[in-house]
């Protein structure tokens, strides 16, 4: 946030920019938290976007018995690989096609006995709130349909009647990591020393960190005609001062009129 | 990726013999090779299978009368066609497993290559 400085004045504006505030020559350059002329108020949302999208990520083990393990199958680029990889994919991309937030596999390894096959199952979900318990979801339901193709795909009289078979006590889920977004610990962490006041409220299942300074949400300050300051004690009513009154208490709604004043003082003269 | 090439069909008479031909652009040795049928208006049916140790597996339907076989040298794929009947009518077309597929027999799910098909028409 910048404030343009003109005239004689800026020389010394330049020595007061506060807050880490840098003067460029014309103007205060703010950090993130600040803004105005000298970088001395703090702004009163934060920008805590959440990602369009939330990943997950299966680390999984199954052992395909349909197919003979060749050396040739740990080189990437081999023919028999590539065969093997596309057959996989098909063969993954039907069990898990009930699954919304089902990406694809990443094979990551393949080893003997029959076909071990190392691999990712790749999950999305858009963002929401509920994004953690959508995932967690997802991942129940992987590990049910792996586990009942794995029972029900095997090879029987050693003939595979499936476009794959495989050994049932071979799947294992190794491990699942899910993308962290927190948004709570986000607004802390950027609202700095004014962690303990900014907030995070939701609109549209949106994230929006804010404090109370900031209006339109139900923790914000009502400073009636004031103005709504953070400090470092926390969110403050600076009250205005009119033509015709004066302005106090903690959210200004304590208004004096100045000629009831002016007009008793003068009456004691 | 493994071009296949039928060849062999036409029509001929019920009770007649055909021999159909499959060419391939790659190794089949290490595959399980089918030949498939689709009459119009059915589904596509696996008609014989051949493991790459030449195991060999059939539908009921053909049984003792298709012949399935494979020359490794040749790459080439073959269908003995004997004793012909109207329902036999069909686009034939063969097809590929992955390397090293095993426990293979003529279900469609084996197989990821596949030919364009010849047509088979058995009529008097």
């Known amino acids: 946030r910048t404030t343009t400085c003109f005239g004689d004045g800026c020389q010394n504006t330049a020595s007061r920019c506060k807050n880490g505030g840098t003067w460029d020559g014309l103007k205060c350059q703010c950090p993130n938290l600040y803004y105005g002329e000298l970088c001395e108020e703090v702004v009163s949302s934060i920008d805590i976007g959440p990602p369009e999208t939330i990943s997950a990520q299966m680390e999984l083990t199954v052992t395909v018995t349909s197919v003979k393990f060749t050396e040739e199958l740990k080189n990437h680029s081999s023919q028999e690989f590539q065969e093997f990889k596309q057959t996989f994919t098909e063969q993954m991309n039907i069990v898990y096609s009930g699954i919304p937030e089902y990406v694809g596999v990443n094979i990551t390894k393949l080893r003997l006995g029959s076909v071990v096959v190392e691999h990712d199952v790749l999950l999305r979900t858009k963002y929401t709130p509920e994004y953690k318990t959508v995932l967690d979801n997802a991942t129940e339901v992987v590990k049910e349909k792996i586990t009942k193709v794995t029972t029900q795909q095997i090879m029987i009289n050693d003939i595979c009647s499936d476009m794959m078979c495989f050994n049932t006590t071979g799947t294992q889920v190794q491990n699942i990591t899910v993308t962290q977004y927190d948004p709570e610990e986000d607004c802390r962490k950027m609202a700095k020393e004014y962690g303990d006041y900014f907030v995070v409220e939701y609109r549209d299942q949106k994230p929006y960190c804010i404090s109370p300074c900031e209006p339109g949400f139900s923790v914000s300050k009502n400073c009636n005609l004031g103005k709504c300051q953070m400090s470092l004690s926390g969110p403050q009513c600076l009250c205005v001062t009119t033509e015709t009154h004066w302005y106090s208490g903690e959210t200004c709604n304590q208004g004096t009129q100045k000629s009831l004043v002016y007009g008793h003082h003068h009456h004691h003269h | 990726e493994v071009q296949l090439v039928e060849s062999g069909g036409g029509l001929v008479q019920p009770g007649r013999s055909l021999r159909l031909s499959c060419a391939a652009s790659g190794d089949i040795t290490r595959r399980c090779m089918g030949w498939f049928r689709q009459a119009p208006g059915k589904e596509r049916e696996g008609v014989a299978g051949?493991?790459?140790?030449?195991?060999?597996g059939y539908a009921d339907s053909v049984k003792g009368r298709f012949t399935i076989s494979k020359d490794n040298a040749k790459n080439s794929l073959y269908l003995q066609m004997n004793s012909l009947r109207a329902e036999d009518t069909a686009l034939y077309s063969c097809a590929a497993s992955i390397l090293n597929r095993v426990g293979c027999r003529q279900l469609s799910y084996e197989y990821i290559y596949r030919g364009q098909g010849t047509q088979v028409t058995v009529s008097s």
């Open positions: 051949i493991s790459e140790d030449g195991i060999t």
